[in-house]
Structure formats: structure tokens, C-alpha cells
Interface confidence: low
């Protein structure tokens, strides 16, 4: 470990000089010190903080033959391509024994054309909608005055007279370019040119015009689109199952949406091929030659219930004396809603029709009058939802039941060769 110098005696005999110049300059700062005994490692500080990744070299030369004699140590810090981040106060620091020594400071400064800290960025804005652009530049030398330009035309009579760091634009009706000039005593620097693309405003008042079990008719009010006419609007619909979690402003649907395009005008669209009695979320965006508007918020809608599309399946009807036992299964065809129950009708050859509401049961025992004297008795069954009755089954004749015989089953719906749905096995 370093033995250190005599108390209170600074080891520094040469301190960092000053460097001032334009960006890109290369320069070197040096510290020289004389110590007794093993030379210490020289650390470089910039503004009091150690530079961990400094491009520094250290040269050590003994002044005598004895290890305990004095040494001259020269540390050189190279600054390549001077940048704003390099500016500040530079010092060298060494630890000797129980003391800490800091060199006198040298300063690195920057002076030249204005340097942009922030430039206007390309962006899209809705037509006639206010927005702000930012531009920030600094020297040295200060002051730096800004001049904004729109489509290459200055927005003020002279630098520093108009808006400075932030330009407020009350709205645009056509795609425009913006840039800013930074002026100081050394000259002028021009920022990048930002293109502000004017898109249509978000459509408003998306609403339902009419509803049917498998289709919805929707309409909306288009927003302003500047000088660019709307070319079309796009409507998205997505199933909104309970677990889906679409929020009012959620930007993307959690599953692939059903997308339809509408020619405009009119600002209206019929969405077909939907599931009955199903909640959806819909949204709309309109497009001009400049691009699409933002989407509206998701609007929750629901298709109404329909009636079942087919009759109950596998109806069997058997008779035993004055009783008839009728059994059936739920329709295979879509219910188009919530099944509320079944209606059953039976009729003899010369007797009036009897209509019964069975509820959600799938079997019923009928008490027949006249101990079987009613001839050619037939039974029909239909399923119903809140929207009404589905189609009735074909009439099923009542068959006499003989012990030991299986109950006859009347297959009223022909099985498709390939199942329409593939159900999992539990």
C-alpha cells in the first residue's frame, strides 16, 4: 500500500488544464504528481464523480534507485470527439496513506453552433385537433433562439420572437412539415423536418340500428378528415365472453376479430353470420388516403335470442293401457338462445289436440281417457326459447308396449354422414 506523503502536503505538482472547443474536438488532460514510495493509482473525477470507464493512461518514473525514493507519475486522460456529456470540471484523485488528495480543477467546455437536445418528431394527428411540437437546443455560446417553420415558411418575423421550446398548433386540415432553426452567436443549425400526417378524426356515436338473431345493423357519425375524403370505414366485432375482459378503451381485442369494410357514405353496415343470443363488442375506424383514424371505444352489443332451429331428437312414444310414456332428447340443431322448455301436443284420429308445456323435463307420462279407446294417437314435441317455439317434430304414433320388448324409437332427423360438431369425450 502507498506509504503516503508528509502530512498536509499535496502530491500534485501539475494539474489539468482547460479545453474549450467545438463538438468533435480531441484533447488530452494531464495530472502530474510526486510521491514518496510506491506510486498510487490516479483516478479521474468529472464534476466530483469518478469516471469508471475513463480513457486514461498512467506513466510512472522513479527519481532514484530505491523503491522508497520519490516517483513522478503522469496520468493522461484523452477526450476523443468532444461531446456535451464530456463538459465539466475535471480533477485527479489519489489516496495516500490516511489522506485523500484532489488536484486543482481543469475545465472542459463546449462552444460552437447550437446543438439540438430535442427535435420535432414525425407524428400523426387527427384533423382539426390541437397538438404540440418540441424543439430544444443549447450552446454554448448562449443564448440560443429558435425559429419554427411550417412547410418551410417561418412562423415568426425573427428568431426568438415566436414560440420557442414548444410550438402549439391549433389543428391541421392537411399533412404538413415542421422544422426549427436554432440561432446563436456562432451561426444557425436546422433541425430535422418532421412530417405531421393528418388522419381522420375518430368516428363518433357508434350505435345499433336494428338487431336480429344472426345480424346487427350499426351506424356511426364520421369525424372530420381535413382535405382528404374518407375512402372506407372498418368495423370489428369480437365475441365478448365473460373471461375476455375488454375494457372500454382497451386498444386490442384478445382474439381475432370479425372485420368488415363499409363503403361510405352511408355510415352504416349490416353485420351478418353472427351467433344468436351472444354478446359482442364492436368498434369502428374510418380511413382516408392518409391512413386510418383511431378506433372508437369498444361498444358492447348483443344479438337477440332466436327460436330453436330444429325439433327435439329421438322421440319415443309407447302406450300401456291408459298411460302413454313419451321421451325425447334436446334438439341437435342450434337453440339460438336459452332453452326454456318443451311443448308437447297429442291428438287422436277423432279427438281434439291437447297442448302441454312440459318445462325442461325430457319425458312425460300421459293419462289417456277411455282406457285406450282413442285410436291412431300421435305425439309432436317442440323446444322453445324466449323468442318462441322451434319447429315441431313430425307426428310420432303411439305404439303398444309389450313386456320384454324395447321401446320403439322414432328417428326423425336423419344423421349427417359427418357430424357437424365434434364434441369432446368426458
Amino acid at each position: 500500500a502507498p506509504r503516503g506523503t508528509q502530512a498536509e502536503e499535496s502530491p500534485f505538482v501539475g494539474n489539468p488544464g482547460n479545453i474549450t472547443g467545438a463538438r468533435g474536438l480531441t484533447g488530452t488532460l494531464r495530472c502530474q504528481l510526486q510521491v514518496q514510495g510506491e506510486p498510487p493509482e490516479v483516478h479521474w473525477l468529472r464534476d466530483g464523480q469518478i469516471l469508471e470507464l475513463a480513457d486514461s493512461t498512467q506513466t510512472q518514473v522513479p527519481l532514484g534507485e530505491d523503491e522508497q525514493d520519490d516517483w513522478i507519475v503522469v496520468s493522461q486522460l484523452r477526450i476523443t470527439s468532444l461531446q456535451l456529456s464530456d463538459t465539466g470540471q475535471y480533477q485527479c484523485l489519489v489516496f495516500l496513506g490516511h489522506q485523500t488528495f484532489v488536484s486543482q480543477p481543469g475545465y472542459v467546455g463546449l462552444e460552437g453552433l447550437p446543438y439540438f437536445l430535442e427535435e420535432p418528431e414525425d407524428r400523426t394527428v387527427a384533423a382539426n385537433t390541437p397538438f404540440n411540437l418540441s424543439c430544444q437546443a443549447q450552446g454554448p455560446p448562449e443564448p440560443v433562439d429558435l425559429l419554427w417553420l411550417q412547410d418551410a415558411v417561418p412562423l415568426a418575423t425573427a428568431p426568438g420572437h415566436g414560440p420557442q421550446r414548444s410550438l402549439h398548433v391549433p389543428g391541421l386540415n392537411k399533412t404538413s412539415s415542421f422544422s426549427c432553426e436554432a440561432h446563436n452567436a456562432k451561426g444557425v443549425t436546422t433541425s430535422r423536418t418532421a412530417t405531421i400526417t393528418v388522419l381522420p378524426q375518430q368516428p363518433r356515436n357508434l350505435h345499433l340500428v336494428s338487431r336480429q338473431p344472426t345480424e346487427l345493423e350499426v351506424a356511426w357519425t364520421p369525424g372530420l378528415s381535413g382535405i382528404y375524403p374518407l375512402t372506407h370505414c372498418t368495423l370489428q366485432a369480437v365475441l365478448s365472453d365473460d373471461g375476455m375482459g375488454i375494457q372500454a378503451g382497451e386498444p386490442d381485442p384478445p382474439e381475432e376479430p370479425l372485420t368488415s369494410q363499409a363503403s361510405v357514405p352511408p355510415h352504416q353496415l349490416r353485420l351478418g353470420s353472427l351467433h344468436p343470443h351472444t354478446p359482442y363488442h364492436i368498434r369502428v375506424a374510418c380511413t382516408s388516403s392518409q391512413g386510418p383514424s383511431s378506433w372508437t371505444h369498444w361498444l358492447p352489443v348483443e344479438t337477440p335470442e332466436g327460436v330453436p332451429l330444429g325439433p327435439p331428437e329421438n322421440i319415443s312414444a309407447t302406450r300401456n293401457g291408459s298411460q302413454a310414456f313419451v321421451h325425447w332428447q334436446e334438439p341437435r340443431a342450434p337453440l339460438q338462445g336459452t332453452l326454456l322448455g318443451y311443448r308437447l301436443a297429442y291428438q287422436g284420429q277423432d279427438t281434439p289436440e291437447v297442448l302441454m308445456d312440459i318445462g325442461l323435463r325430457q319425458e312425460v307420462t300421459l293419462e289417456l281417457q277411455g282406457d285406450g279407446s282413442v285410436s291412431n294417437l300421435t305425439v309432436c314435441v317442440a323446444a322453445y326459447t324466449a323468442a318462441g317455439d322451434g319447429p315441431w317434430s313430425l307426428p310420432v304414433p303411439l305404439e303398444a308396449w309389450r313386456p320384454g320388448q324395447a321401446q320403439p324409437v322414432h328417428q326423425l332427423v336423419k344423421e349427417p354422414s359427418t357430424p357437424a360438431f365434434s364434441w369432446p369425450w368426458w
Epitope: 498536509e8 466530483g48 464523480q49 469518478i50 470540471q89 484523485l93 490516511h98 485523500t100 484532489v102 486543482q104
Partner: antibody
Framework: EVQLVQSGAEVKKPGATVKISCKVS????????MNWIRQPPGKGLEWIGL????????SYNQKFKGRVTISADKSISTAYLQWSSLKASDTAMYYC?????????????WGQGTLVTVSS | DIQMTQSPSSLSASVGDRVTITCKAS??????VAWYQQKPGQAPRLLIY???TRHTGVPSRFSGSGSGTEFTLTISSLQPDDFATYYC?????????FGQGTKVEIK
């Protein structure tokens, strides 16, 4: 905003040990040094020592060496001053102070002070 | 250790007066001297460092000068808020040392 908040006043008997804390916020705790200074009632300022929290390196005033320990806990941005074998003459206001960026030996932000009273 | 000798130890002055406080180092400390202001019941406040650089937010009526061993703090026009005790400090090498203080009182 740089803030240095010190622990509360202490009353100790001669020979005892006291440990006071200084919690900092508003700047990088490890990027600077923390100095400790004391001021006996009605008297001037006396430098005790410093610590560089990034590496735990310390420098002490030889006058107090052996009785003083300066430490830091980077995880909670807190510096500590521990003083043992207290004497009545150690009664003073003890300050922590942040080392200035242009010199570690400059104190640009100070804590509110912790009064340590040593009395039998 | 470096000794910092401050004078005067106290002075009386009126609002608007020009006030000068001096500090002498026992050895060459280059320009590594700072000045602090302390009011009763408060922690010291940094005014000047590197002999002549004003700290952030310090009014321009405070100025410092000197190098080597002799240093001066000047208050060009004393204000009511300036009545306090002033300390010099060398920030050249450890152990850091302070002057004994100068109390500026209202005449």
C-alpha cells in the same frame, strides 16, 4: 430535492457509545461522499471524517481516530456515525453533510443536526 | 494539519454596509477555500467555494477572493438576512479544517 434527515437527539453517560444515522434522498447516494462535522455548544465547526458509500472508503480526523467509526448502508441510502468512549467534551451538535460535486471536501447540503449530550 | 485563522472574531455593522472577513491558511491551499453562513439553530449553508465561486442560489452581494494562504469574503451591501456567523474552510486536503468563525452583529 436533496434531503439529509438525521436521527433524533441522544443523551448518554460518559464512557457510553452512540450511533447516529443520516438518511439521504434526492441524489445518488453512492456517487458522492458523506462528511460528518460536529459543533460543541457556542463553538465552531470541527470535521470528523468522511465516507465514500460506493466503496466504503473512509478518511478520519486523526484527533478522533480510534473512537469514531463511519459506515454506510447503500441499500437504504443511510450513513452512520458511531462514537465510543464518550466524554462530556463530546457534547455537541453532530451534522452529516453531502460532499459537493466539485470537491468531495465541500459540504453543499447538510442534515438538520443531531444533538448528543454526554452527562453523568 | 492546516490551520485556518479567521478575523475578526466578531464585528458590528449596519444594513447597507460593506463587510469584509478574512481567513489565513497556515500553508498554501491554492484556491481551495469555502465560506459558510450559519444562523442560530440552523445547519451551516455553503456560500462560496474554490475561493470565488458562488454556490447555487447565493445572492451576488456575496463574493470571495484570494489564493495561496490569504482569503476574503465580502458582503457588498449588508442585508437584514445577513446577520449570522460566517466560517471559512479549506477543502484542499484532509483533515478538513474550519476557521473559528466571525459573528456579524447589528450595530
Amino acid at each position: 430535492e436533496v434531503q439529509l434527515v438525521q436521527s433524533g437527539a441522544e443523551v448518554k453517560k460518559p464512557g457510553a457509545t452512540v450511533k447516529i444515522s443520516c438518511k439521504v434522498s434526492g441524489y445518488s447516494f453512492t456517487g458522492h461522499t458523506m462528511n460528518w462535522i460536529r459543533q460543541p455548544p457556542g463553538k465552531g465547526l470541527e470535521w470528523i471524517g468522511l465516507i465514500k458509500p460506493s466503496n466504503g472508503g473512509t478518511s478520519y480526523n486523526q484527533k478522533f481516530k480510534g473512537r469514531v467509526t463511519i459506515s454506510a448502508d447503500k441499500s437504504i441510502s443511510t450513513a452512520y456515525l458511531q462514537w465510543s468512549s464518550l466524554k462530556a467534551s463530546d457534547t455537541a451538535m453532530y451534522y452529516c453533510a453531502h460532499g459537493h460535486y466539485e470537491s468531495y471536501f465541500l459540504m453543499d447540503y447538510w442534515g438538520q443536526g443531531t444533538l448528543v449530550t454526554v452527562s453523568s | 494539519d492546516i490551520q485556518m485563522t479567521q478575523s475578526p472574531s466578531s464585528l458590528s455593522a449596519s444594513v447597507g454596509d460593506r463587510v469584509t472577513i478574512t481567513c489565513k491558511a497556515s500553508q498554501d491551499v491554492s484556491s481551495a477555500v469555502a465560506w459558510y453562513q450559519q444562523k442560530p439553530g440552523q445547519a451551516p449553508r455553503l456560500l462560496i467555494y474554490w475561493a470565488s465561486t458562488r454556490h447555487t442560489g447565493v445572492p451576488s452581494r456575496f463574493s470571495g477572493s484570494g489564493s495561496g494562504t490569504e482569503f476574503t469574503l465580502t458582503i457588498s451591501s449588508l442585508q437584514p438576512d445577513d446577520f449570522a456567523t460566517y466560517y471559512c474552510q479549506e477543502h484542499f486536503s484532509t483533515p478538513l479544517t474550519f476557521g473559528q468563525g466571525t459573528k456579524v452583529e447589528i450595530k
